[in-house]
């Protein structure tokens, strides 16, 4: 480091800034000698407000250093980012955002949950960091499957729904009326035939939520960003793989009237056996042959798959047959069914273990005269499509 040039003046001894040290320390510093400043952990080199990764000053011929010594300032992670559908509390002290400060993220209770503990610390790299080392914000995921509707297990007929009974119910308005089920705050599950032809003409799809009355003027509006129809669905050639997903342009805010339905757990098959009762809601045709003004629901039992397939062999539906990707529900004597206008809606079941409702079926097809004797409603079997659903949502 020493270069002796007697014609030049020595530079003044450098003084280490608070929370920093100088290296090398020399008795004198002459022309071309240099020193560097290093900060303690949790402190950073700042020249005013400009951050520096390193600092070295060189002694000049006139006996001055070529740059002033920066400060070692305590790392400041800055105000933490806002958490969508949540909030942040300062644990260390009000507005304290410096090195080793702790903050706690929480989700809006009742309607959102967080998988992590939400605790973040301001670390030496200047980023808020979780106990798992994550620098990204935690996520407030919508709670799913909460409902004020209680299933008595007995068929109680088509009845008007009450607020909060079917908060996942989505009204799809296009050339025809159809339905869907919210499964995330920005994804709707529906029947492929209900949105067929809408992949390009998406602007014609009007999506409404948080309503009971079909013609209500007060609703939460959503618009589609993308429509995904199952690649195995062929329009006009039966209803196999009659399933689709709609990605919403914006996330909807979850509340007691707008909430996703849960997707089935692996154990769901045991809750959807023959004679187990599910519930379906919709604004489709009623006994009078008109679209329902108010959201209606009916509790209906699952029908033995073979029995259903045989029934539709006896009285065929043009171009359709019951496949392994379908489940049937209804009464042998008829009278309780979903109908045109209900398509895409969810057939839901209560998971007794979690006390949450989940979607087991999607209203797909059935006899032209809805609710006819041995003319069961046919639903897309959602458990067969969990990988498909997850793949689309995760890769969007």
């Amino acid at each position: 480091h020493h270069h002796h040039h007697h014609a030049s003046q020595p530079c003044p001894d450098p003084t280490a800034p608070p929370n920093g040290h100088i290296s090398p320390v020399q008795a004198t510093y002459v022309l071309k000698d240099s020193f560097s400043v290093f900060c303690k952990t949790g402190f950073e080199l700042l020249q005013g407000s400009v951050p520096l990764k390193s600092f070295t000053a060189v002694c000049q011929k006139d006996g001055s250093w070529d740059r002033p010594i920066p400060e070692c300032s305590i790392i400041d992670c800055g105000p933490p980012d806002d958490l969508p559908n949540g909030h942040v509390d300062y644990i260390t002290g009000p507005e304290v955002t410096t090195y080793k400060a702790v903050i706690q993220y929480s989700c809006e209770e009742t309607f959102y949950t967080m998988s992590s503990n939400g605790k973040y610390v301001c670390e030496a790299d200047g980023f808020w960091t979780s106990s798992k080392g994550e620098k990204s914000l935690p996520v407030c995921k919508p709670v799913c499957g909460l409902s004020t509707h209680t299933s008595g297990g007995r068929i109680i007929g088509g009845q008007p729904a009450k607020p909060g009974d079917f908060p996942w119910q989505v009204l799809l308005l296009g050339e025809t009326t159809a339905a869907g089920a919210l499964i995330h705050d920005d994804w709707v599950l529906t029947a492929a035939h209900a949105v067929y032809g809408k992949t390009e003409a998406m602007s014609s799809l009007d999506i409404r939520m948080g309503i009971l009355k079909r013609l209500s003027l007060i609703y939460t509006q959503a618009w589609p960003e993308a429509v995904f129809i199952h690649e195995g669905y062929t329009h006009g050639a039966g209803f196999d793989n009659d399933i689709a997903l709609i990605k919403l342009k914006n996330k909807v805010t979850i509340n007691r009237n707008i909430m996703p339905i849960c997707l089935p757990r692996k154990e769901a098959a045991s809750l959807m056996k023959t004679d187990f009762v599910g519930t379906v809601a919709g604004w489709g045709l009623t006994q009078k042959g008109f679209l329902a003004r108010n959201l209606m629901f009916v509790d209906i039992p699952i029908v033995d798959h073979q029995k259903c397939a045989t029934a539709y062999t006896k009285q065929p539906y043009p171009g359709a047959k019951v496949t392994v990707n379908m489940l049937c529900a209804g009464l042998d004597r008829g009278g309780k069914d979903s109908c045109r206008g209900d398509a895409g809606g969810a057939l839901v079941f209560l998971d007794n273990e979690t006390q949450r409702w989940f979607v087991g079926g999607i209203v797909s097809w059935g006899s032209i005269n809805c609710g006819g004797s041995e003319q069961y409603g046919v639903y897309t079997k959602v458990t067969n499509y969990i990988p498909w659903i997850e793949n689309i949502i995760n890769n969007f």
């Epitope: 020249q47 005013g48 407000s49 400009v50 520096l52 390193s54 600092f55 740059r67 920066p70 800055g78």
Partner: antibody
Framework: DVQLQESGPGLVKPSQSLSLTCTVT?????????WNWIRQFPGNKLEWMGY???????SYNPSLKSRISITRDTSKNQFFLQLNSVTTEDTATYYC???????????WGQGTSVTVSS | IVMTQSQKFMSTSVGDRVSVTCKAS??????VAWYQQKPGQSPKALIY???YRYSGVPDRFTGSGSGTDFTLTISNVQSEDLAEYFC????????FGSGTKLELK
């Protein structure tokens, strides 16, 4: 030698987002310093918009904080400006610049003119 | 922090000595830089930390001041020095002065 080059659309519609890219050659943006966006309005007034530091931390002009985002792609040695909800008041020449507070030479791009108009 | 360059224009002659001033609305220590900008060009850095000259900058350019009052002095003005000069504080965030245009008398 360090060089900075701005790129992006010259015309943006009101209420839309303005997105610009700064490509840096001759120096790694993760090596040191602060990598800034600065704009110059007609009439020559200069405004510092914000920076992304070598470590990836950002600092923004408080007057723009609600609608600005500066990000980077270290693999391409680029950093980016996104300014949301633009109005005609955002019409300016946008510069990217390396500022080191004297610790290493300042370098500026040549600037890119952006007009906000319907 | 507001940086005020009270003189929008300054008239000078080749060979003159001229001082461009800049006043900060609060203490900025010595965290001030000076820039020169010619029409159609990007700003060019002249001075950092109030008084340190960037390498390659002619020694006729001198910066001084600390706290709130800062001066850029050009001794022996050359025709190529006719340009607009901006101060910049980088003590708290970054703010530029409004500029002073140096023109011939």
């Amino acid at each position: 030698d360090v060089q900075l080059q701005e790129s992006g659309p010259g015309l943006v519609k009101p209420s839309q987002s303005l997105s610009l890219t700064c490509t840096v050659t001759g120096y790694s943006i993760t090596s040191d310093y602060a990598w800034n966006w600065i704009r110059q309005f007609p009439g020559n007034k200069l405004e510092w918009m914000g920076y992304i530091s070598y470590s990836g931390r950002t600092s923004y002009n408080p007057s723009l904080k609600s609608r600005i985002s500066i990000t980077r792609d270290t693999s391409k040695n680029q950093f980016f400006l996104q300014l949301n909800s633009v109005t005609t008041e955002d019409t300016a020449t946008y510069y990217c610049a390396k500022l080191g507070g004297g610790h290493g030479m300042d370098y500026w791009g040549q600037g890119t003119s952006v007009t906000v108009s319907s | 922090i507001v940086m005020t360059q009270s003189q929008k224009f300054m008239s000078t002659s080749v060979g003159d000595r001229v001082s461009v001033t800049c006043k900060a609305s609060q203490n900025v220590d010595t965290n001030v830089a000076w820039y020169q900008q010619k029409p159609g060009q990007s700003p060019k850095a002249l001075i950092y930390s109030a008084s340190y000259r960037y390498s390659g900058v002619p020694d006729r350019f001198t910066g001084s001041g600390s706290g709130t009052d800062f001066t850029l002095t050009i001794s022996n003005v050359q025709s190529e020095d006719l340009a607009e000069y901006f101060c910049l504080q980088y003590n708290s965030y970054l703010t530029f002065g409004s500029g002073t245009k140096l023109e011939l008398k």
